[in-house]
Interface confidence: medium
């Protein structure tokens, strides 16, 4: 089972008020990067996995959930240095003896190839080229994600030019 990711759709034929409205825009908050239907925030500081998880929560987001290999590649393309690693929202569930996403779904064997041990207190991080497991207590950078939000910009017609 893959991590479920909500999709946003935009209906541009919505009711118009007297003020002309542009079609709804999908915007990421400032400092967040848009990657298809997600907004990503790459941390500058380092934290253990649990603290990274908590930090994303305070930002009304979650640690990164990766749907498939294509999304992994798109995310890795944003990592500009081979020496940097980022926690994602995947850790090893000892009770279920499987890799588990923080939304409760399990890792499909085809999705990500994880280098490293699958054992208690193991969490997953990504680098520019690979996916690894490491002790969750290790402090490293992390990636938060949130779904794109609908923002309606009210503008006058001549500002469209």
């Amino acid at each position: 089972q893959k991590p479920s990711i909500g999709k946003c759709s935009v209906d541009i034929q919505q009711n118009r008020t007297k003020t002309t409205e542009r079609p709804d825009l999908l915007n990421c908050p400032i400092y967040w990067q848009q990657v298809q239907e997600k907004c990503l925030l790459f941390s500058h500081t380092v934290n253990p996995w649990n603290n990274s998880l908590a930090d994303c929560s305070t930002k009304e987001s979650s640690l990164l959930l990766i749907q498939d290999k294509d999304e992994l590649t798109r995310t890795q393309n944003l990592i500009h240095d081979k020496a940097i690693s980022f926690w994602i929202g995947l850790n090893f569930s000892l009770s279920e003896k499987n890799w588990k996403w923080i939304n409760g779904s399990f890792l499909s064997s085809n999705d990500l190839k994880i280098t490293g041990d699958a054992k208690e207190n193991s969490c997953v991080y990504i680098s520019q080229t690979s996916v690894y497991s490491e002790y969750c207590s290790t402090e490293m950078k992390w990636i938060c994600q949130k779904e794109l939000t609908l923002v309606r910009n009210k503008v006058s017609p001549d500002s469209w030019l």
């Epitope: 500058h44 380092v46 020496a83 207590s137 402090e139």
Partner: antibody, heavy 122, light 108 residues
């Protein structure tokens, strides 16, 4: 100016103790993994220990485990190495080094101090 | 522990020469390898990290390659300031972060 400056080296008898300090400046010290690396006279480099940014994760080389203690004071931008039960084979120049980027898993050392010499001899 | 074997232990070369130093790991380390330059009485300087990434400020005549167990540092055209000792270092996720024995590049 981005730099690391070690101090505290000197001559000590076998079985004695010494505390090395490393003062960091010019960068955000609390965000970085820090290490001690040593080099015996005329020999190669040997990694000794590292400490994570918060101090929660620490590793030692087997050769110093149980005798050396690494610590840090982020408020003072300082790294320390307490060396006990010193042996002749601990004689070396001790370097303080910063990890490249603030990532914990792959420790490349991009900033080094000039080193401080520790001599263990009777 | 992972062992790193550098070869040659020393090399004599002239200014303008192409110099190649190899580093072999006792087990696979992916691309987690660095190269350092050290001059007498000085601290080491990071040249290459992640096997092939050039550290900021390092001249482009230095390059690194390799993956798994075999790695190479190449100096394309040796300059007078390049005469030094070069070390490789592995940085897989579990310490110790071992160094190779070093390669001394001397003036012929």
């Amino acid at each position: 100016q981005v730099q690391l400056v070690e101090s505290g080296g000197g001559l000590v008898k076998p079985g004695g103790s010494l505390r090395l300090s490393c003062a960091a400046s010019g960068f955000t010290f609390p965000q970085y993994y820090m290490s001690w690396i040593r080099q015996a006279p005329g020999k190669g480099l040997e990694w000794v220990s590292y400490i994570s940014p918060s101090g929660a994760t620490i590793y030692y080389a087997d050769s110093v485990k149980g005798r050396f203690t690494i610590s840090r004071d982020n408020a003072k931008n300082s790294l320390y190495l307490q060396m006990n039960s010193l042996r002749a084979e601990d004689t070396a120049v001790y370097y303080c080094a910063r990890s490249l980027m603030s990532t914990g898993t792959h420790l490349y050392f991009d900033l080094w101090g000039r080193g401080t010499l520790v001599t263990v001899s009777s | 522990d992972i062992q790193l074997t550098q070869s040659p232990s020393s090399v004599s070369a002239s200014v303008g020469d192409r110099v190649t130093i190899t580093c072999r790991a006792s087990q696979g380390i992916s691309s987690w390898l660095a190269w350092y330059q050290q001059k007498p009485g000085k601290a080491p300087k990071l040249l290459i990290y992640a096997a092939s990434s050039l550290q900021s400020g390092v001249p482009s005549r230095f390059s690194g390659s390799g993956s798994g167990t075999d790695f190479t540092l190449t100096i394309s055209s040796l300059q007078p300031e390049d005469f030094a000792t070069y070390y490789c270092q592995q940085v897989t996720s579990t310490p110790p972060y071992t160094f190779g024995g070093g390669t001394k590049v001397e003036i012929k």
